[in-house]
């Protein structure tokens, strides 16, 4: 056969898969004689043990046999079925041969593997001896497992294969073999060829791109050719019988199978894998060895085989990058209107539904940050005790307050309401003061005075005060903000000289000051400084952080005092503070 | 065995809204589209919608788009439907179906 | 949408006949169709899909053929619990539609 190699002819520059504009577009493998140089397996070669064989010539009504012997352990005598894919050169041909006289019933098979599935176009033999009377070339699509018909060729159709002669090919029967008595002349007595088009005379061949029918037809990743019986002259069963069945045998200088590796248009070649198998170097986002499926993450859209007019290149599935899986759906593809099929899995960074584009519940939409930012969703931290539920709207981030409860967390009591202890209505109405007494207002109380000691920020520190307290830290103030009946201090503890049953470690934590004492400045604190802090235990709103209140000591820090409160320390774990 | 059992009022006054519940068991709810399909008396059937229950979405025929909700529980493997604004030619039958390769599975309806 | 053509509307048969129905698409469905079978006072049953594959446990006196826009239900060898209206559906694309039945 020709000696095309499957990689031949690849250009090096223009990328076949795409056009000029990056757009892809259908590309298909190099055609080749699949069978080149592959190996193929016979049932009969003559020459094991070595046999004569006679080859048969005619002058004019003369019949001339020259007589040979057929050697399989010698190069030059023997007739070895490489011969039949080997580079087929016609001034030296060689030729496979099989033993002599195997007639009817018996056959003759030869068998190529592609080693993959390919698109066949034909399959053609050139003989050394007269062509068979009768033959049939068969296909594999499961890589020898299972066979089909692929054509027949009889003088006697029905006889031989039960096949009527020269059957119409129908749109109905395309992808059915038919019989033939074409090629099965006798003569010539040696170069006869046989070459089946696989796509001849089928109807649906000019729409080729548009035929599952017919691309399944061509598919093949075997062929067999079986030889059933010999052409003679009649002359096998006289006298000298013996002269005249050395004379029959099949014998072929050639076989190939002209046809394209099966890439389903998503492919300009084939190469050879790491366990050296042929596969489709796959392109338009397709995988598998024939590009018959997408690759992961690219089922937005139904795997599809390339046409002349459309790649149908596989798309990825739109997650806006918070998912690395996703699966297809038929149905919601078809209801799409057959744009988008792709179903993510497993949304994550709290985003959810299809495309992962809303946020979950619990979650709301940061809109300064595009949905495929990793933090788009941003929690909603709706307080334990003041909202009515966890899930906030999915755009503002508001929580549902209840009743008398306000802000985007429902953190605080609403004008008019005032806290109370109750964590089913934490924010009561404020009742309304008689005429005779004056209406004393939560946030700015007008007698100070008598509600406590504003401190004057001189305050000392002794030991008798530092037992009195159930803890005393070194705080440094960060921030502050106003959660309805609170402030909500934000504050590194930097050292702990004292704690109680609540273990209170070092650290960023909360530090809650009722708005009423912040206001009568009892205790007086500014953000950004650092403090002592001598206070009593008292749960706090969050059930985390510290409380400080009108009796709490909070006095700025001094460095000298550090030595001081260690010594205090020590006096307390020896049970000093008791006695004071 | 697959079941898709249908509840709702058999009779709903014009300009009010229909709401209709069905309730499954024996696959995998969140798996299927949910389709709600309907038939006027002695007439052929009209598709209304779909939801896919494993992430809400929804599918509607634009005839009914603004007046027809399909919402799904995955907690209860429910599909709801509500139709607003009901005229007289809304006298149906109203089936849930579950999609997949056709219709395989209906609602009594 | 896409509308799909039933005929005849109605016709009638002896027990033992074969009964053809046919159903034309608007334009062309690949083979996204569906017949369902329905009597009355009952819901729609499910008879073949992808337009030629048997639906589990339908006797395969019922058969479906046609690809694109003409497509076939074939009841051989009828039976009287036949009797029932037969209805073709499309879901090629959405709103997925009914012959008139």
């Known amino acids: 056969g020709p000696g095309l190699s499957m990689f031949a002819g690849q250009a090096a520059q223009p990328d076949p898969c795409s056009d000029e504009n990056g757009h892809p577009r259908r590309c298909i493998p190099d055609f080749v004689n699949a069978a080149f140089g592959k190996d193929v397996r016979v049932s009969s070669t003559c020459g094991r043990p070595p046999a004569r064989y006679c080859v048969v010539s005619e002058r004019g009504e003369e019949r001339l046999r020259s007589c040979h012997l057929c050697n399989a352990s010698d190069p030059k005598k023997a007739h070895p079925p490489a011969f039949l894919t080997d580079l087929n050169n016609p001034h030296n041909l060689t030729c496979w041969q099989s033993e002599n006289y195997l007639q009817f019933p018996h056959n003759v098979t030869l068998t190529l593997s592609l080693g993959k599935k390919f698109e066949v176009t034909y399959v053609s033999l050139q003989f050394c001896s007269p062509r068979p009377e009768s033959m049939a070339i068969y296909k594999s699509m499961d890589y020898g497992r299972t066979w089909v018909p692929f054509q027949f060729y009889s003088t006697q159709c029905r006889k031989m294969y039960n096949r009527p002669h020269r059957a119409p090919i129908t749109k109905q029967n395309e992808q059915e073999a038919v019989c033939t008595d074409s090629h099965t002349d006798m003569r010539p007595l040696s170069g006869g060829l046989i070459a089946f088009s696989t796509l001849d005379g089928r109807p649906s061949a000019h729409d080729f791109d548009n035929s599952p029918v017919l691309q399944d037809w061509v598919t093949a990743t075997d062929i067999r050719v079986a030889f059933s019986r010999l052409h003679t002259f009649g002359d096998e069963n006289e006298d000298d019988s013996e002269l005249a069945r050395d004379s029959y045998f099949y014998a072929v200088s050639d076989l190939q199978v002209g046809g394209r590796c099966k890439c389903n248009g998503h492919a300009a070649r084939c190469v050879r894998d790491r366990d050296d198998s042929l596969v489709c170097d796959c392109r338009h986002n397709t995988a598998g060895p024939e590009c018959d499926r997408c690759k992961p993450f690219h089922y937005d859209r139904p795997w599809q085989r390339a046409t002349a007019r459309e790649a149908n290149e596989c798309v990825a599935c739109n997650c806006n990058l918070h998912a690395r899986r996703c699966r297809f759906n038929m149905e919601l593809y078809k209801l799409s209107g057959r744009k988008s099929g792709g179903v993510c899995l497993n949304c994550r960074h709290n985003t959810a539904g299809r495309h992962c584009h809303y946020c979950k519940e619990g979650y709301y939409r940061d809109m300064g940050k595009p949905i495929t930012h990793r933090k788009a969703c941003k929690a909603c931290d709706c307080h334990p005790v003041g909202a009515a539920g966890k899930t906030c709207n999915q755009t503002t981030g508001q929580c549902p307050c209840k009743d008398g409860v306000t802000g985007i967390t429902c953190n605080r009591c609403a004008k008019g309401y005032q806290q109370s202890r109750s964590p089913i209505a934490p924010c009561i109405k404020i009742p309304v003061a008689p005429p005779t007494t004056a209406a004393s207002s939560v946030e700015e109380p007008e007698d100070c005075d008598s509600y406590c000691k504003a401190s004057k920020g001189k305050l000392k520190i002794n030991m008798k005060k530092y037992c009195k307290k159930d803890y005393a830290v070194q705080i440094h103030i960060l921030k502050a903000d106003k959660a309805g009946d609170w402030w909500k201090f934000t504050v590194n503890i930097i050292s702990v000289y004292k704690q109680g049953t609540s273990r209170i470690r070092r650290g960023d934590q909360s530090l809650w000051i009722r708005s009423r004492d912040i206001a009568c400045k009892c205790p007086k604190i500014k953000p950004l400084k650092k403090y002592l802090l001598l206070g009593n235990a008292e749960d706090s709103p969050d059930q985390s952080g510290i409380v400080a209140d009108k009796s709490s000591l909070v006095i700025q820090w001094r460095d000298t005092w550090a030595r001081r409160l260690r010594k205090f320390q020590q006096r307390e774990k020896k049970g000093k503070c008791k006695k004071a | 065995q697959v079941q898709l059992q249908q509840s709702g009022p058999g009779l709903v006054k014009p300009s009010q809204t229909l709401s209709l519940t069905c309730a499954i068991s024996?696959?995998?709810?969140?798996?299927?589209?949910m389709h709600w399909i309907r038939q006027p008396p002695g007439k052929g059937l009209e598709w209304i919608g779909a939801?896919?229950?494993?992430?809400?979405?929804?599918s509607y025929n634009q005839k009914f788009k603004g007046r027809v909700t399909i919402t799904a529980d995955k907690s209860t493997s429910t599909a709801y439907m509500e139709l607003s604004s009901l005229r007289s030619e809304d006298t149906a039958v109203y089936y849930c179906?579950?999609?997949?390769?056709?219709?395989?599975?209906w609602g009594q309806g | 949408d896409i509308q799909m053509t039933q005929s005849p509307s109605s016709l009638s048969a002896s027990v033992g006949d074969r009964v053809t129905i046919t159903c034309k698409a608007s334009?062309?469905?690949?083979?996204?169709v569906a017949w369902y079978q329905q009597k009355p006072g009952q819901a729609p049953r499910l008879l073949i899909y992808?337009?030629?594959n048997r639906y589990t446990g339908i006797p395969p006196r019922f058969s479906g053929s046609g690809y694109g826009t003409d497509f076939t239900l074939t009841i051989n060898n009828i039976e009287s619990e036949d009797a029932a209206y037969y209805f073709c559906?499309?879901?090629?694309?959405?709103?997925?539609?009914f012959g008139q039945g």
């Open positions: 179906a579950r999609g997949g390769t056709g219709f395989a599975y």
């Open positions: 024996g696959y995998t709810f969140t798996s299927y589209n």
């Open positions: 939801i896919y229950p494993g992430n809400g979405d929804t």
């Open positions: 334009q062309s469905v690949s083979n996204d």
């Open positions: 992808y337009a030629s």
């Open positions: 559906q499309q879901d090629y694309s959405s709103p997925w539609t």
